[in-house]
């Protein structure tokens, strides 16, 4: 049953004279192991003998012996799976059909394999992708339908006969499916490779040439361009003519359109290979290139930088920054379109040339008010001098200058007057918008910068004003110099330091806290009577009669001021003591008699003592001695003694006469 035999191997194998052939082969005989194997060259079946005729290249017997002449052909298989064969060397006349006659215990099979042996090494085959584009990586494949373990070969890539630098990857296949040697080369072709010859060369192990295959590269690429300009440096003056020519050095496929670009933007109606710019203007300065397209895409030339040179245009001035604050720094920039760039500048301030300023920038490190004004400049290059533009205004802002506080009143100012002050300044930028005054008060400002003080106080000493714009500038304070009558007049005892005792030396001082003007006069008075005109009132030996209410007056040219009344108190021992009797010095017995000790004392008598005619002190200590009922024996002379903190005083004797009542007389 033939279906029991299954073979796998390449259908045809290729080799050349002197090389070798390796035939990978597998089989399956389901009924048992292989018992006999014969390799025929071009076998033919003989119906008469029911056997195959042909050259026997290899024969194995049951005992496994192989004749020595069969060493060229080797069966590398086994009895149940592998039927691999090797012929080394292989000869031209080995071409044809190889027949593998397989016999097992019960079955037979003839498997045919084609062998193609050429006289010389056959060339490999280069495979290219359907389209090659510049800069796109492609894989070049060189395929040779040959591989044999006993005959090493190599494939080398050449470009225009020169080995290619890129590393190729070589692979071999010796399988039942295919036998080949393949070299793959990854390659990024450039447009310059278009039309170049690529060769895959087959070499033996020693590098000896065996055969090759060549292809011509067809590299699709955008047009490659060269731009030429007259004049060649592309530097011209306004009014000159410029010609640019676009040359296509290579294009695959052929180009279809041409255009010109300036600064990346297409120029309208410029679709030829020559760009003529007649009487150029400065606006035509820029980067020019030509663009030519084909089916691959657009190609661009290198850029040509056309410089149209011209004298500076009227200049403008840029100020960093205006308005400027006094003391800050300011930079002026002269801006003028020119080609080539200006090399020299002339600066003007309010129409007058600024000496020594020849640069594009002017830097003023510390701005002052006089720097304000119009700044203009003139730029100059090799082609000429530009015109002076309109200029720019520098506004210098500063606080109000020379601020003064001015008193409008006639002098001197008196306490209680109405005073008007004005706040003046020399200059200000921006304008003054408000004023401030020190010290603050409930004063009215009838108009901007004017202050009215009603009923000016004696103590309004100085006033300062500030004029304010964005900043406040304070004036030096102005003294009002308000004149007023003496203030805080009072009487002050200078001596003695303690209480005044009769006989002391006493000094009183007329004090005042302030006076303007300072020149003053003093007046002392007691009970409306003028006592003196000095600041002090002196008593060499004070007497109780000097006690009383004293006032002093101080006056200046503005007015006079009196002190409060000051009471002068003189302390003295009891004096002028006398004993008065009530109802009289003659009293009838049985009646009531009251003796009173009268005295003059400061402080008042604090303790009384009564004495009789014998100078015997009586047990009575009050001011009044009451005898009730009075007796005849009470008749006699009495005196009293008064005591205070200063001392003692005694009265003269006063006689009390007590006479008998009619009853007593009647009884007698």
């Amino acid at each position: 049953d033939s279906s029991k035999w299954v073979f796998e191997h390449p259908e045809t194998l290729y080799a050349w004279e002197g090389a070798c052939v390796w035939i990978p082969c597998t089989y399956r005989a389901l009924d048992g192991d292989l018992e006999s194997f014969i390799l025929f060259h071009n076998p033919e079946y003989n119906k008469n003998t029911s056997k195959f005729d042909g050259t026997r290249l290899y024969e194995s017997t049951k005992d496994g012996k192989v004749p020595s002449e069969q060493k060229r052909v080797q069966f590398l298989g086994d009895k149940n799976k592998n039927c691999t064969l090797s012929i080394h060397p292989v000869h031209l006349n080995d071409s044809g059909q190889l027949g593998l006659r397989m016999e097992s215990k019960t079955e037979k099979w003839m498997e045919r394999i084609h062998l193609n042996v050429s006289e010389r090494p056959f060339p490999p085959h280069i495979q290219l992708p359907p389209e090659i584009q510049e800069s796109q990586e492609v894989t070049l494949t060189c395929l040779l339908n040959f591989s044999c373990y006993g005959y090493p070969i190599q494939l080398q890539w050449l470009l225009e006969g020169v080995p290619m630098r890129q590393a190729a990857v070589t692979s071999t296949s010796l399988t039942i499916k295919s036998v080949f040697t393949r070299s793959e080369l990854k390659f990024s072709p450039q447009w310059s490779h278009h039309g170049k010859i690529v060769t895959c060369q087959l070499q033996d192990a020693d590098g000896k040439f065996l055969s090759n295959d060549t292809v011509q590269l067809n590299v699709k690429h955008t047009p490659k361009l060269e731009i030429k300009v007259t004049p060649s440096d592309a530097i011209v003056r306004e009014g000159d003519s410029v010609t640019m020519t676009c040359e296509v050095s290579s294009s695959n496929p052929e180009y279809t359109t041409v255009s010109w670009l300036k600064d990346g933007t297409s120029l309208k109606k410029q679709n030829t290979f020559t760009l003529n710019l007649r009487e150029v203007t400065k606006d035509q300065s820029g980067k020019y290139c030509c663009q030519v397209s084909n089916d691959v895409g657009p190609g661009r030339s290198e850029e040509v930088f056309l410089q149209v040179q011209y004298a500076p245009e009227p200049s403008t001035v840029q100020i960093l920054h205006s308005p400027a604050v006094e003391g800050s720094q300011v930079e002026f920039l002269c801006m003028s379109l020119a080609n080539p760039l200006p090399t020299n500048y002339t600066w003007y301030h309010n129409g007058k040339e600024m000496q020594g300023r020849t640069e594009e920038k002017v830097h003023i490190p510390k701005i002052l008010p006089w720097h304000a004004g119009t700044y203009s400049c003139v730029a100059e290059n090799i082609l000429g001098t530009g015109q002076r533009g309109p200029g720019a205004e520098l506004d210098v802002q500063y606080p109000p200058k020379k601020v003064t506080t001015v008193i409008q009143n006639p002098m001197p100012i008196r306490e209680g007057d109405t005073v008007t002050l004005s706040c003046n300044y020399n200059s200000s930028n921006p304008s003054v918008t408000r004023y401030e005054w020190k010290p603050h008060g409930a004063w009215e400002e009838p108009s901007l910068g004017v202050l009215k003080i009603q009923n000016v106080g004696w103590d309004n000493t100085t006033i300062a004003c500030a004029a304010c714009n964005s900043w406040c500038s304070w004036a030096s304070p102005v003294a009002l110099n308000v004149q007023y009558a003496p203030r805080d007049v009072r009487v002050r005892k200078i001596k003695p330091l303690s209480e005044i005792h009769s006989g002391n030396s006493v000094s009183l001082q007329c004090d005042f806290s302030s006076s303007h003007p300072k020149e003053v006069q003093f007046f002392w008075e007691k009970n409306g009577r003028l006592l003196g005109k000095e600041s002090q009132l002196n008593f060499d030996s004070i007497s109780p009669e000097d006690a009383g209410s004293y006032s002093c007056w101080v006056n200046n040219s503005i007015g006079q001021t009196a002190s409060k009344a000051w009471t002068l108190e003189v302390l003295y021992a009891p004096r002028r003591l006398r004993v008065s009797m009530s109802p009289g010095d003659q009293v009838m017995e049985g009646k009531s008699a009251t003796l009173t000790c009268e005295s003059d004392a400061n402080p008042p008598v604090s303790h009384y003592t009564w004495f009789d005619w014998n100078n015997q002190s009586l047990p009575y200590h009050s001011q009044k001695l009451r005898l009730e009922p009075v007796k005849v024996q009470h008749s006699g002379a009495y005196w009293c003694q008064g005591t205070n903190s200063v001392g003692k005083g005694r009265s003269p004797l006063s006689t009390l006469t007590v006479y008998y009542s009619p009853e007593t007389i009647g009884r007698r």
Partner: antibody, heavy 123, light 102 residues
Framework: AVTLDESGGGLQTPGGGLSLVCKAS????????MGWVRQAPGKGLEFVAF????????DYGAAVKGRATISRDNGQSTLRLQLNNLRAEDTGTYFC????????????????WGHGTEVIVSS | LTQPSSVSANPGETVKITCSGS???YGWYQQKAPGSAPVTVI????NRPSDIPSRFSGSKSGSTNTLTITGVQAEDEAVYFC??????????FGAGTTLTVL
């Protein structure tokens, strides 16, 4: 063929003035810059003056600046050089020169020369 | 502009004459006799008038321009002036290089 014919040379008096004329033919005169180059006896070439095709600017050598005026008549295809206040050092051969372009690029783009006219300044 | 005062060469040799000193374009002018009309051999760095032989070529590198005569011939014997311009477009010439063909 481009032809440039100079005239107006000869013996000149110091302090006086001269007027040289260049008649051009064989090219579109109005499209090209034109100028004058001179050569003192035994010396090298010296740039005198050049004028752009549209007469939009003039360039003068340092030795003649302020004394020379270059002008052109595109209708007559003529170039003129007026040189005043003549000095002995103005003696030499004056060549008419054509620029390869419409502009004047000094002495770098001359592509045609006249045969020259000799000027002698002497008292 | 700076150029050598003289150079010499045998017929068939290559001669190079340098000129330096300008950042702008250059021209080369041949004068066979003093006072005779100069002939432009190169203008604008590399351009050769149509009637000038191809053995004359010009090249520029930086501020130096070179006139090259490849295969010099006896009739090339002359004074060669280089020309350029300053930044203000005023023309300037070199002092001239005398080429002697031996």
């Amino acid at each position: 063929a481009v032809t440039l014919d100079e005239s107006g040379g000869g013996l000149q008096t110091p302090g006086g003035g001269l007027s040289l004329v260049c008649k051009a033919s064989g090219f579109s005169f109005s499209d090209y810059g034109m100028g004058w180059v001179r050569q003192a006896p035994g010396k090298g070439l010296e740039f005198v003056a050049f004028l752009g095709s549209s007469s939009s600017y003039t360039d003068y050598g340092a030795a003649v600046k302020g004394r020379a005026t270059i002008s052109r008549d595109n209708g007559q295809s003529t170039l003129r050089l007026q040189l005043n206040n003549l000095r002995a050092e103005d003696t030499g051969t004056y060549f008419c020169a054509k620029s390869a372009y419409g502009g004047s690029y000094g002495s770098s783009s001359i592509d045609a020369w006249g045969h020259g006219t000799e000027v002698i300044v002497s008292s | 502009l700076t150029q050598p005062s003289s150079v010499s060469a045998n017929p068939g040799e290559t001669v190079k004459i340098t000129c330096s000193g300008s950042n702008n374009t250059y021209g080369w002018y041949q004068q066979k006799a003093p006072g005779s009309a100069p002939v432009t051999v190169i203008y604008d760095n590399t351009n050769r008038p149509s009637d000038i032989p191809s053995r004359f070529s010009g090249s520029k590198s930086g501020s130096t321009n070179t006139l090259t005569i490849t295969g010099v011939q006896a009739e090339d014997e002359a004074v060669y002036f280089c020309g350029s311009r300053d930044s203000t477009y005023v023309g300037i010439f070199g002092a001239g290089t005398t080429l002697t063909v031996l």
